[in-house]
């Protein structure tokens, strides 16, 4: 939602988290803001304090409930308003009403883990984080591998397009340094977007046995 | 209803202090804010700042600061304002006027009757 | 202090003819919400105040649709297409975008 110079853009992490991020040039420094949310069909409403993450920039986390409980539904819409504090009131900043899924962005992926290395290939695992029972198996992933020499940017995309948390990378060279790292998207909502990166796993290929080709 | 009922005129000598009074009703006093705007005889309006019952946050116009205080009693939904080193330049009538807590639309949506506050030697 | 000025001081209007008063201010008073909190207030002989206009141009609840408020950025005005024997008094513009917040002088309308 943008009102003249501000942008407020928030997301559900599927189960009891709504990420906020409001910018605004010119926004005063000193000012206290807050981001309030109030469901249509519930009976709790929640507020988190603005923090600054830049120079015109700030962020909180709605918290809902405990990580894993499911806060919200497809037919929920909830009214999220940025106020800031003016003298002793609270002024509307921006505001939107926020379908949740519609608006999606999972956690990262946890617990990547080693299941199998070897000179040429690794089979790596993972899980996702306070992922809603709704999407079922409708989930895709991305992954990237950084190689010696390489940024992330650089890394190919490997997409695996249905809820597969585990991948075998091929083709790598023999002992050597290598790290992974996945993210996940619901295939469901608008506006959603990829989860952040995952934790880098960092793996090591084993070397090529002596006096053998590689 | 709401209504917003201040007290009597006050007359008051030079250097001395008044407080003048208003009781809410017709509301639950503590989600909205009371503000304080004062008009000198045949002059125009000037608000002085206001708090909010809720939590007793005050924010005086700078104009005021040091000379103003702002309170509330909230067992008998009444709000006070209290002008202290008075002079003849503060002869005014004094209004409380109902503030929403999160400005969205209007400043003041209902005023008290005023209080006529004169400072004579 | 953003400074609200008015004018005419002084509004002599015959009654069932159309009305108008200006209200300049001194900067721009559209809120950095992208809202421009310029609110109208009557104030009837020996009344209160009384709020007829808000956000420029929306009447207050119970309003008659007779006074309606335009306008943007600095300059704004009150119209009463039709004045009425109870439209007699004194009319302020207030603005409610930077603190601290700030009435106009007032124009006195009366009936020729």
């Known amino acids: 939602a943008v009102n003249g110079t501000s942008q407020f853009t928030c997301f559900y992490n599927s189960r009891a988290n709504i990420s906020c991020v409001w910018s605004q040039d010119g926004a005063l420094q000193d000012t206290s803001c807050q981001v309030h949310a109030w469901p249509d069909r519930r009976r709790w409403n929640q507020t988190c304090e603005l923090l600054p993450v830049s120079q015109a920039s700030w962020a909180c986390n709605l918290i809902l409930g405990a990580p894993d409980s499911q806060k919200l539904t497809t037919v929920d819409i909830v009214t999220l308003r940025v106020l800031c504090r003016e003298g002793v009131r609270w002024r509307v900043m921006a505001i939107q009403d926020f379908k949740p899924f519609e608006n999606l962005r999972l956690m990262a992926p946890i617990s990547l883990q080693v299941v199998h290395v070897e000179t040429h290939r690794c089979n790596i695992s993972w899980e996702i984080s306070q992922a809603s029972h709704y999407f079922e198996r409708h989930l895709e992933f991305e992954a990237r591998t950084l190689s010696p020499g390489h940024t992330w940017e650089e890394a190919p995309l490997l997409t695996l397009k249905q809820k597969q948390e585990w991948i075998c990378l091929e083709t790598l060279t023999p002992d050597t340094q290598y790290e992974f790292q996945v993210r996940v998207k619901p295939l469901q909502g608008e506006f959603t977007t990829w989860s952040p990166w995952s934790q880098p796993l960092a793996f090591r290929t084993k070397p090529a046995a002596l006096g053998k080709d590689t | 209803e709401v209504q917003l009922v201040q007290s009597g005129a006050e007359v008051k000598k030079p250097g001395a202090s008044v407080k003048v009074s208003c009781k809410a009703s017709?509301?639950?006093?503590?989600?909205?804010?009371i503000s304080w705007v004062r008009q000198a005889t045949g002059q125009g309006l000037e608000w002085m700042g206001e708090?909010?019952?809720?939590?007793?946050?005050?924010y005086y116009n700078e104009m005021f600061k040091g000379r103003v205080t702002m309170t509330r009693d909230t067992s008998i939904s009444t709000a006070y304002m209290e002008l202290s080193s008075l002079r003849s330049e503060d002869t005014a009538v004094y209004y409380c006027?109902?503030?929403?807590?999160?400005?969205?639309?209007?400043?003041?949506?209902?005023w008290g009757q005023g209080t006529t506050v004169t400072v004579s030697s | 202090d953003v400074v609200m000025t008015q004018s005419p001081l002084s509004l002599p209007v015959t009654l069932g003819q159309p009305a108008s008063i200006s209200c300049r201010s001194s900067q721009n008073i559209v809120h950095s919400n992208a809202n421009t909190y310029l609110e109208w207030f009557q104030q009837r002989p020996g009344q209160s105040p009384r709020l007829l206009i808000y956000k420029v141009s929306n009447r207050f609840s119970g309003v008659p649709d007779r006074f309606s408020g335009s306008g943007s950025g600095t300059d704004f005005t009150l119209k009463i297409s039709r004045v009425e024997a109870e439209d007699v008094g004194v009319y302020y513009c207030?603005?409610?975008?930077?603190?601290?917040?700030?009435f106009g002088g007032g124009t006195k309308v009366e009936i020729k």
């Open positions: 708090i909010y019952p809720g939590d007793a946050q005050t």
């Open positions: 017709g509301y639950t006093f503590t989600d909205y804010v």
């Open positions: 006027a109902r503030g929403s807590y999160t400005y969205d639309n209007y400043a003041m949506d209902f």
């Open positions: 207030f603005q409610g975008s930077h603190i601290p917040w700030t």
